[in-house]
C-alpha cells in the first residue's frame, strides 16, 4: 500500500483511503461532535491567572470538560463498534467477491486498520490523560477559588458587620444631635424670651431716663429763667434808679424792650451793659449754635468767661473725650465749658487765661497767662500759653511747651501709662506733669499725699489736692 492518505469529505467525515493495486479502499469514520480542533482559541492554561475566576464560570467549564470526556468515551465505543461492523461486512464481501489471493492483502489492511485503531486509542488515551490533568488542575483552581471566595465572603461579612456597627453608631449620634438641636432650640427660645424681657426693661428704663432728663432740663431752664428774671429785675431796678436820679428828664419813663443780641463771650455781655455775675447764653463764632456759660462780672474788672470750676466734688470729672469736647456739669457750680467752644473762641482773637486757686488753709493764689489758645480737635486741643505772672508759682504748672489734651478714652500724653487713668480726669498731661485741675476731689484732712488729686505743683507741690479752682478767659484787649 504505497498510497495511504487521510482527508476530509464534503460533509466533514474523516476518510481513510487505501490504494492497493487496482483496488482502492475507502473507510468513512464518524467525526467527534464536541471535540475542539487544534486551531481552537482554547488554551489549556488560560485559567491560571492572578485574579480568581468567577465561581460559576469554573463550574461551567468543568461541566464542558465532563461532556467532552463523555463524548470521547461514546466516540471510542462507536469507533470500536463501527470498525467491528465494517470488519464483518468487509470480511463477508471479501469472502464473497474477492479472489482468494486477495485475502492476504485484506488481512494486511485489517492489520493496518487495527494498528491505526490502536494508535487512535493511544491518542485518545493521551487526550483522556490530558483532560484528567486539566480537570485536576481545574479542581485545584476551583478549590483555591472557593477558598478565596470564602475569604472574601468572610471579609464581606466582617465589613457588613462593621458597617452595621457604624450605622448603629451613626443613628445613635444622629439621635444625640437631634436631641441637642432640640435642646439648643429650647435654649435659644428661652434666651430670646430673656432678651425680649431685657429689651422691655431697657426701653422702660430709657423712657424713665428720658423723663428724668426732661425734668432736669426743665429744672435747669427754670433755674436759668429765674436767674435771668433776677438779672432783668436787677437791671430794671438799676434803670429805675438811673431814671429817678436823672432830674427833670424829658424822656419817656417806659423801659424799652431789650434787643435780642448774640454774645460771643462774657466780655461782650459785659460791654452790652450786663454787669451781674450769672449764667449767660453765648453763641459759637460764625455759627448759631449756643452754649451756656457762667460770667464773672466782678473779679479783676469783669467780663470773664468761666471755662472750668471745681468747688465741692459734686461733679465727676473722669469723663470721655466727647464730654470734654462739648462740656459737662452745671455752669452755676462745678463744670467744664467745652474744648470745642474754647478752641473756636480763642482762635478768633487773643485771649488771656487766669487760673484762680484755693487751698484748705484759706490761702488763695492765681496764675495769669497773657496769651492762651487751644488748637483744633484735629490737634487734640493742644494748649498754648505765653507770659506767666501771678502768685501760684513762678514756673508754669501747665507743662511748656503745651501738651495735647488727654482723657480716659483719648490717650495723648507722653507717659507709658495713661495719665488720665492714673491721675483721673481730662487734662493737658505731659508724663504726667505738674498739674491736673480735673483730678479727684478730696475733702479736707484727706487732701495730702494724693497724687491723683487737684494738683498745681508750683504752688502746693506733688501730693496736695486743692479745695477750689476756677479757669477763666477774657480777650487780651478788654
Amino acid at each position: 500500500y504505497n498510497n495511504f492518505r487521510k482527508s476530509m469529505d464534503s460533509i466533514g467525515k474523516k476518510q481513510y483511503q487505501v490504494q492497493h493495486g487496482s483496488c482502492s479502499y475507502t473507510f468513512l469514520l464518524p467525526e467527534m461532535d464536541n471535540c475542539r480542533s487544534s486551531s481552537s482559541p482554547y488554551v489549556s492554561n488560560a485559567v491560571q491567572r492572578d485574579a480568581p475566576l468567577e465561581y460559576d464560570d469554573s463550574v461551567q467549564r468543568l461541566q464542558v470538560l465532563e461532556n467532552i470526556m463523555e463524548n470521547n468515551t461514546q466516540w471510542l465505543m462507536k469507533l470500536e463498534n463501527y470498525i467491528q461492523d465494517n470488519m464483518k461486512k468487509e470480511m463477508v464481501e471479501i469472502q464473497q467477491n474477492a479472489v482468494q489471493n486477495q485475502t492476504a492483502v485484506m488481512i494486511e489492511i485489517g492489520t493496518n486498520l487495527l494498528n491505526q485503531t490502536a494508535e487512535q486509542t493511544r491518542k485518545l488515551t493521551d487526550v483522556e490523560a490530558q483532560v484528567l490533568n486539566q480537570t485536576t488542575r481545574l479542581e485545584l483552581q476551583l478549590l483555591e477559588h472557593s477558598l478565596s471566595t470564602n475569604k472574601l465572603e468572610k471579609q464581606i461579612l466582617d465589613q457588613t458587620s462593621e458597617i452595621n456597627k457604624l450605622q448603629d453608631k451613626n443613628s445613635f449620634l444622629e439621635k444625640k444631635v437631634l436631641a441637642m438641636e432640640d435642646k439648643h432650640i429650647i435654649q435659644l427660645q428661652s434666651i430670646k424670651e430673656e432678651k425680649d424681657q431685657l429689651q422691655v426693661l431697657v426701653s422702660k428704663q430709657n423712657s424713665i431716663i428720658e423723663e428724668l432728663e426732661k425734668k432736669i432740663v426743665t429744672a435747669t431752664v427754670n433755674n436759668s429763667v429765674l436767674q435771668k428774671q433776677q438779672h432783668d429785675l436787677m437791671e430794671t431796678v438799676n434803670n429805675l434808679l438811673t431814671m429817678m436820679s436823672t432830674s427833670n428828664s424829658a424822656k419817656d419813663p417806659t423801659v424799652a424792650k431789650e434787643e435780642q443780641i448774640s454774645f460771643r463771650d462774657c466780655a461782650e455781655v459785659f460791654k452790652s451793659g450786663h454787669t451781674t455775675n450769672g449764667i449767660y447764653t453765648l453763641t459759637f463764632p460764625n455759627s448759631t449754635e449756643e452754649i451756656k456759660a457762667y460770667c464773672d462780672m466782678e473779679a479783676g474788672g469783669g467780663g470773664w468767661t468761666i471755662i472750668q470750676r471745681r468747688e465741692d466734688g459734686s461733679v465727676d470729672f473722669q469723663r470721655t473725650w466727647k464730654e470734654y469736647k462739648v462740656g459737662f456739669g452745671n455752669p452755676s457750680g462745678e463744670y467744664w465749658l467745652g474744648n470745642e467752644f474754647v478752641s473756636q473762641l480763642t482762635n478768633q482773637q487773643r485771649y488771656v487765661l487766669k487760673i484762680h486757686l484755693k487751698d484748705w488753709e484759706g490761702n488763695e493764689a492765681y496764675s495769669l497767662y497773657e496769651h492762651f489758645y487751644l488748637s483744633s480737635e484735629e490737634l487734640n486741643y493742644r494748649i498754648h500759653l505765653k507770659g506767666l505772672t501771678g502768685t501760684a508759682g513762678k514756673i508754669s504748672s501747665i507743662s511748656q511747651p503745651g501738651n495735647d489734651f488727654s482723657t480716659k478714652d483719648g490717650d495723648n500724653d507722653k507717659c507709658i501709662c495713661k495719665c488720665s487713668q492714673m491721675l483721673t480726669g481730662g487734662w493737658w498731661f505731659d508724663a504726667c506733669g505738674p498739674s491736673n485741675l480735673n483730678g479727684m476731689y478730696y475733702p479736707q484732712r484727706q487732701n495730702t499725699n494724693k497724687f491723683n488729686g487737684i494738683k498745681w505743683y508750683y504752688w502746693k507741690g506733688s501730693g496736695y489736692s486743692l479745695k477750689a479752682t476756677t479757669m477763666m478767659i477774657r480777650p487780651a484787649d478788654f
Partner: antibody
Amino acid sequence: QVQLVQSGAEVKKPGASVKVSCKASGYSFTDYNMVWVRQAPGQCLEWMGYIDPYNGGTGYNQKFEGRVTMTTDTSTSTAYMELRSLRSDDTAVYYCARTRDRYDVWYFDVWGQGTLVTVSS
Amino acid sequence: DIQMTQSPSSVSASVGDRVTITCKASQDVYIAVAWYQQKPGKAPKLLIYWASTRDTGVPSRFSGSGSGTDFTLTISSLQPEDFATYYCHQYSSYPPTFGCGTKVEIK
C-alpha cells in the same frame, strides 16, 4: 554718674533719735523727689515718706507720722531723715531713693547704699 | 494700704532656666507696678516700671507683664548674676507698697 551716698551705720538706745543723711550727685537735686524706704531684717521693704527738694513739700506714711521728719539742704544737695522715739523694731537698713518724676512719687530709679540703724539697750 | 502678695517666696533654679515670679495686688493698681532686684548687702536696683518697661541697661531677658491686680516678672534664661531677691512695688495709690520678695537661689 547719678549717685546717692548715705551716712554710716548707727547704734541707738530705745527712745533716742537718729538722723540719716543722703548726699546726691550727678543730677539737679531740686528736680526730683526723694523718698525714704526701710528694710527690717527678714522683712519687706517699707515706704516711709518723701520730700520735694524744690519746695520742701513732704508726705509721710501714716505709720511714721509724728515720729519722722524729712528735710533737705539744697546748697549741699543733701536729704535728711530723722526718726524719733526709737524702738527695737526700728532696727533696719534705711535707704534713700530718687523718684523718676519730680511731680509724682512713682518708682525709684536710684538708691543709696543703705544705712543700718540698730536700736538696742 | 494696698497689699502686694508675691509668690513663690523662694525658687531654686539652674543657669539657663526660665523663672516666673508673680505679684498680686489687693486692689486695682492699673499698671503702676515696678520690679526691683536686690543682692545681699546691696541696695535694690530698678528693673521694670509701668509693669512692662525695662529700665535703661536692664538685659532683655527680664520682662514684665500684667495690669489691674496680677503682675509677672519673667527671667527667660537665668544667668549666674541673676541669683538675688526680687521685689514688686505698686505706686498707684498712697502709700506706695512693696511685696515681701522672691529669693531666686541656685539649684
